[in-house]
């Protein structure tokens, strides 16, 4: 019995087609992805093949102005239109709190939303009961397939799930649910979830009875043969894991941002064993036309976005200096504002011993592309922020050793004075440079804000200690020459859209007046 699994993950609000790098579409003839194009391909496959499932492995939420404005209603509407069969909860589905998940998505979705390792307690338990499920049995042709969901147990550190949701260990939570499916005579089981490729592989290895793993969170690109675009494969598609009980379990993921549609064909025998598995992600490029009815719907929903981008978010009573003459040479108040917003967006009081789990921010000065003049009645709009942060990136959470941070700050000034983008703006860090010294030895003082303290204060950086840092995804991926971050990072979780982080902070503060205050000397 042959099953076709179509899958997406980490779409992050890319409802409209995007450029090849998943930023805003500029030249339509070269654009990719988007739900209208995705629908064309999905329908084409549904017409050609008998047993098809369309699955999403989480993180539909967060990433563009679509989410900022529609807050998840757009996800429910367009996923319903595409007739998704199931979705797993990702960490970003909790970005607007549990209410921001329940009302726009859980109550509106016409497909099951899954996670076996999230358990509700207290008053929330009855409110959320039945709105998401640990598993769902889906009829597919003459057969049935069980789908079990899972979500990163790091979600409380990455998003805002509140105190009434407990995130259990994925493997511990999945096993009893899979066992339950087996007792219901369901012998074809897909684990669909959002914990990253390493955990996907562990689930394939450790959870008895799981036949296929469809994952997300790590934006992993897998491909067999010559890849069709710029993404470099982390392995073959599907990636085969040998389980502890001796079965070959295919593991798949489909990069991110709706650029690809994962396409996996599985042949099962009567016992539910995977006899064969093959496929590849399908690049959703301009050779695939956008479906006209979905496209028309997108255009209708688009109108509200254009109105939103000119509305006032808050006010500044000072000039926000985002000029390259400042931000690439010295501490600039736009850099301070952005870093303060980044830390504020990551406030998570999950442990009495820590005032927060992260206190530090670094930001490449070259990523700040425009100032904002306060003499326009102090008004700040989304449009203004889009000029400051035009690249559509995210502000991510990483874990780095102190020694890596030291290297990063040396790199920040290794060719100081040439107006290059690698000069770092900071938050929760005090750095002192001596530019008379030779490159690679210019950082003379590096103090960082404590986290395991009730009164935050600055302590010298320890080389062997592991620190959490918020930074742009551009830096996490080694951009501007920060190869040491990419090579030495111990953990990397993608965060929220850069503009959204700053806009939320400005809306919260209402009036802002960031200063230059001696963070960099």
């Amino acid at each position: 019995w042959e099953l076709t699994i179509l899958h997406t993950n980490d779409v992050h609000s890319r409802l409209e087609q995007t450029s090849e790098d998943s930023s805003k579409c500029v030249n339509a003839s070269r654009c990719m992805g988007g739900v209208a194009r995705l629908f064309t391909k999905v329908q084409q496959i549904r017409r050609a093949e008998p047993n098809v499932l369309l699955l999403d492995a989480g993180d539909q939420y967060q990433g563009t102005i679509w989410f900022t404005v529609y807050k998840g209603a757009e996800v429910a509407h367009f996923m319903n239109a595409l007739r998704y069969d199931a979705m797993a909860l990702g960490n970003h589905e909790f970005d607007n709190g549990v209410e921001g998940l329940i009302e726009p998505l859980l109550k509106e979705a016409k497909f099951p939303i899954l996670s076996a390792n999230i358990k509700a307690k207290g008053p929330l338990a009855s409110q959320i009961s039945g709105l998401y499920l640990p598993y769902k049995v889906l009829p597919v042709g003459d057969e049935v397939v069980g789908i079990v969901g899972y979500t990163s147990k790091e979600t409380p550190f990455l998003s805002n799930p509140g105190t009434n949701l407990v995130f259990e260990d994925e493997i511990t939570a999945l096993q009893p649910e899979v066992d339950k499916l087996k007792t219901l005579n369901v012998n074809k089981i897909i684990a669909l979830g959002h914990s990253g490729f390493e955990m996907d592989k562990l689930i394939a290895q450790k959870v008895r009875g799981v036949d296929v793993v469809v994952g997300g969170h790590s934006n992993t690109f897998l491909y067999t043969g010559n890849p069709p675009s710029k993404e470099v494969p982390a392995g073959k598609y599907p990636f085969i894991v040998t389980s502890d009980d001796g079965r070959k379990v295919p593991v798949v993921q489909a990069y991110a941002f709706g650029k690809y549609l994962g396409y996996l064909k599985i042949e099962f025998d009567e016992r539910g064993n995977v006899i064969s598995s093959h496929g590849n992600p399908i690049l959703l490029n301009s050779s695939i036309p956008e479906d006209p009815s979905i496209k028309a719907d997108i255009n209708k929903w688009r109108i509200k976005l254009d109105n939103y981008s000119t509305q006032e978010l808050g006010k500044t009573i000072v000039y926000l200096d985002g000029s390259s003459q400042s931000c690439r040479f010295r501490e600039c108040n736009m850099g301070n504002l952005i870093c303060d917003a980044m830390i504020n967006n990551n406030l998570r009081h999950t442990d009495e011993m820590f005032w927060n789990h992260v206190s530090m921010c670094i930001l490449n000065g070259g990523g700040i592309r425009s100032p904002i003049d306060e003499r326009n009645n102090g008004t700040i709009t989304w449009e203004n922020l889009a000029a400051v942060l035009p690249f559509g990136g995210t502000f991510d959470l990483v874990q780095l050793k102190g020694s890596t941070l030291k290297k990063a700050f040396e790199h920040s000034v290794h060719r100081y004075g040439q107006s290059t983008g690698e000069f770092l703006q900071v938050g929760g860090i005090h750095v002192v440079y001596d530019l008379s010294r030779k490159p690679g030895d210019r950082v003379v003082k590096l103090d960082v804000l404590c986290t395991k303290c009730r009164v935050p204060s600055y302590d010298p950086l320890k080389m062997d200690e592991v620190y959490k840092v918020i930074l742009p995804n551009f830096l996490a991926n080694g951009g501007d020459g920060f190869q040491m971050i990419k090579d030495e990072l111990l953990r990397h979780d993608s965060g929220d859209q850069d503009i959204n982080v700053v806009s939320t902070y400005i809306s919260k503060m209402k009036v802002i007046y960031p200063a230059v205050e001696g963070r960099i000397k």
Epitope: D269, E270, R271, S276
Partner: antibody, heavy 114, light 107 residues
Amino acid sequence: EVQLVQSGAEVKKPGASVKVSCKASGYTFTAYFMNWVMQAPGQSLEWIGRIYHNNGDTFYSQKFKGRATLTVDKSTSTVYMELRSLRSEDTAVYYCATSYVGDWGQGTTVTVSS
Amino acid sequence: DIQMTQSPSSLSASVGDRVTITCRASQDIGDSLNWLQQKPGGALKRLIYATSSLDSGVPSRFSGSGSGSDYTLTISSLQPEDFATYYCLQYASFPWTFGGGTKVEIK
């Protein structure tokens, strides 16, 4: 649990036909196919062909094409293998086996003797 | 047709021995290979499917490996109940074909 139950032993004369049945249970019958395999005394196994339960599509080994016919009765989840123009070398145990031979019938002994 | 050459045709071994049986296909069969066990009395049982996946209930002392046209069944420590005849089966293309069998006997 998958189960395949075959009909009983048959003794046939050369030139006659035999029809062996295989009744399946414990799975969604229409979603799969059935294989037929023969084993002559003291010999290895030999694949005869397969039939898709849903629409009756068949594949045969060249050796058995024209002499073997596989049919299906969906209402009773039963598959049949008919072998015509029997000769002494057709004396063997005939097995039905699921799609990828994960489960086997108990075998039906067919003896061709004058 | 794809020919499956199985070796050895028979072997004598003692309990606890490591036993290796090989199957060579006349062309690449890309992982489409099963291993079957036939006990005296005729009952057939699949041990390994898709080259290396172990059927449920099959002891972990059985393992399969290989690629292309060369495949191996290994019994890491032979047990009394393992004395039987073993067959490989390729299902890469029609007609499906079996190896000639390997009879594992008590030394």
